[in-house]
């Protein structure tokens, strides 16, 4: 007996070939010897079965000999041993039929598990593997679950049922609802404005949910809520925002905020929530702040940053085209009694400058002059 | 957007072989036979080769049996013409062509080519 | 192999005119009969399936009839996008044929 597997939903096509390539009568009949359908010369004529209207056969490879049943959206139950009967003989053909959804929404956050159900014919017992866009292989019986799901874990889920030998392969699309970046970190000297974006890792036709940007100044004791806006369908408007420091935000997507001047006290790290509209959980992206200022007290020149910075960058002050005069890992550094000149302050991570502040010490009569 | 995009088309002498494809979007590719349909410069549209929604049945115009050769990938959504031993004859714009079935209670569904590529042409010239 | 004949080769007519084309079948072919509508340089549309049943988004100027070896394509009120080469197809026997086209020019 033919084995042959459906998925819910397709069209499968079931052969039947007699010896003489010449048009003749056939039947398609089920396990209960009910009739699906049959030729009357030219004209198809169909049974009382369950499959009437989803049953076909294709006139023009008739004449070739071939007798197609052509069964379209299978169900599960379509499952059956399908039987033509043609020139005084019987092919038979079992038609198992399976079906593979994701349990939840095809959307979720970053974070949250899939479940993959596999829908199969009594007495089938099919073995599943799927591989994930990022080659992951699971494999597992009628259900698959991945937990703690990845940005990389969205994209085309491949999965591939076994039966009898025989295989039929299924594609979920997956789509991780996430920030493009879990975290990042802006360098600004003092006074320049500050631009923060936050790009989302998808594309969806409407989104809609609410978000808040909590920041925690490095000066601060406690954290505080800088802004909170809503989001209809990737239109961006905002609820309420501080007076100190007061952000402006870009109306479309990817969320963007603008902080008009970096200053000392709003250093630190912050973190912008976004709840999506029928989602449970939210998305989060970390964004970071540090702020460098060079000043020249008297005798003094002073470079100093603030914000969160990793114990490896160095903090640098050097007269233009010199060596450093002075290079620590601390966020303070300075020259008593600079050489008059250019000095720059850097902040750097393996030598490779984050963050660059001029300051021009003129000689000893004079005031300083910040470029 | 429902189409169908071939490519591989170019400039072959008599003898060659080339390799035709047709990237399918927009519906479920594999619910459809899919056939090669190609016209003459100046001529009418000539139906060349035709395939089962698993690939498992192929069947050709006599003008080119033996020498061209269907197959599909339902996995990348796509569908081939492999063409060897060309001819001048064979010089044609060569569109894909999806098959609807158009269904009835008392008859069997006729068959149409309601979606078809841009075209891609095959010049076979020495 | 079925031969589908179509006729006239070409005709020329106005915008407005009642504009008829026939196919015809080598043998019978039921209604397993299609018309497709051809612009230069662009692939065919399908306008009618199975002898008589508009394909959607064609519009009502165009009808189809026939059946067993004698088919035609009517156009009530030639328009000016109307200006194609036509032809019928059949879907009752393998090798799927085509007619040898009409061509609709401008009077």
């Known amino acids: 007996k033919k084995v042959v597997l459906g998925k819910k939903g397709d069209t499968v096509e079931l052969t039947c070939t007699a010896s003489q390539k010449k048009s003749i009568q056939f039947h398609w009949k089920n396990s209960n010897q009910i009739k699906i359908l049959g030729n009357q010369g030219s004209f198809l004529t169909k049974g009382p079965s369950k499959l009437n209207d989803r049953a076909d056969s294709r006139r023009s490879l008739w004449d070739q000999g071939n007798f197609p049943l052509i069964i379209k959206n299978l169900k599960i139950e379509d499952s059956d041993t399908y039987i033509c009967e043609v020139e005084d003989q019987k092919e038979e053909v079992q038609l198992l039929v399976f079906g593979l959804t994701a349990n939840s929404d095809t959307h979720l956050l970053q974070g949250q598990s899939l479940t993959l159900t596999l829908e199969s014919p009594p007495g089938s017992s099919p073995s599943v593997q799927c591989r994930s866009p990022r080659g992951k292989n699971i494999q597992g019986g009628k259900t698959l679950s991945v937990s703690q799901l990845e940005l990389q874990d969205s994209g085309t889920w491949t999965c591939t049922v076994l039966q009898n030998q025989k295989k039929v392969e299924f594609k979920i699309d997956i789509v991780v609802l996430a920030f493009q970046k879990a975290s990042s970190i802006v360098y600004k000297k003092e006074g320049e404005q500050v631009e923060f974006s936050f790009p989302l890792a998808f594309t969806v036709e409407k989104l809609t949910g609410s978000g808040e940007l909590w920041w925690q100044a490095e000066r601060a004791s406690s954290s505080k809520s800088w802004i909170t806006f809503d989001l209809k369908n990737k239109e961006v408007s905002v609820k309420r925002v501080t007076q100190d420091p007061k952000l402006q935000m870009g109306k479309k997507l990817p969320l963007h905020l603008t902080l008009p001047q970096a200053l000392p006290q709003y250093a630190g790290s912050g973190n912008l929530t976004l709840a999506l509209e029928a989602k449970t959980g939210k998305l989060h992206q970390e964004v970071n702040l540090v702020v460098m200022r060079a000043t020249q007290l008297q005798k003094n020149l002073t470079c100093e940053v603030w914000g969160p910075t990793s114990p490896k960058l160095m903090l640098s002050l050097k007269l233009e085209n010199k060596e450093a005069k002075v290079s620590k890992r601390e966020k303070a550094v300075w020259v008593l009694n600079p050489e008059a000149g250019m000095w720059q302050c850097l902040l750097s991570d393996s030598g490779q400058v984050l963050l660059e502040s001029n300051i021009k010490v003129l000689p000893t009569w004079s005031t300083p002059v910040q470029p | 957007e429902v189409q169908l995009l071939e490519s591989g088309g170019g400039l072959v002498q008599p003898g060659g072989s080339l390799r035709l494809s047709c990237a399918a979007s927009?519906?479920?590719?594999?619910?459809?036979?899919t056939s090669w349909v190609r016209q003459a410069p100046g001529k009418g549209l000539e139906w060349v080769a035709v395939i089962s929604y698993d690939g498992s049945n192929k069947y050709y115009a006599d003008s080119v049996k033996g020498r061209f050769t269907i197959s599909r990938d339902n996995s990348k959504n796509t569908l081939y013409l492999q063409m060897n031993s060309l001819r001048a004859e064979d010089t044609a714009v060569y569109y894909c062509?999806?098959?609807?079935?158009?269904?009835?209670?008392?008859?069997?569904?006729?068959?149409?080519?309601?979606?078809w590529g841009q075209g891609t042409t095959v010049t076979v010239s020495s | 192999d079925i031969q589908m004949t179509q006729s006239p080769s070409s005709l020329s007519a106005s915008v407005g005119d009642r504009v008829t084309i026939t196919c015809r079948a080598s043998?019978?072919?039921?209604?397993?009969l299609n018309w497709y509508q051809q612009k230069p340089g662009k692939a065919p549309k399908l306008l009618i399936y199975a002898a008589s049943s508009l394909h959607s988004g064609v519009p009502s100027r165009f009808s189809g009839s026939g059946s067993g070896t004698d088919f035609t394509l009517t156009i009530s009120s030639l328009q000016p996008e109307d200006f194609a080469t036509y032809y019928c197809?059949?879907?009752?026997?393998?090798?799927?044929?085509f007619g040898g086209g009409t061509k609709v020019e401008i009077k």
């Open positions: 197809q059949q879907s009752y026997s393998t090798p799927l044929t």
């Open positions: 927009g519906f479920t590719f594999s619910n459809h036979y």
């Open positions: 062509a999806r098959e609807e079935k158009y269904s009835s209670s008392w008859y069997v569904g006729v068959d149409a080519f309601d979606i």
């Open positions: 043998q019978s072919i039921s209604t397993y």
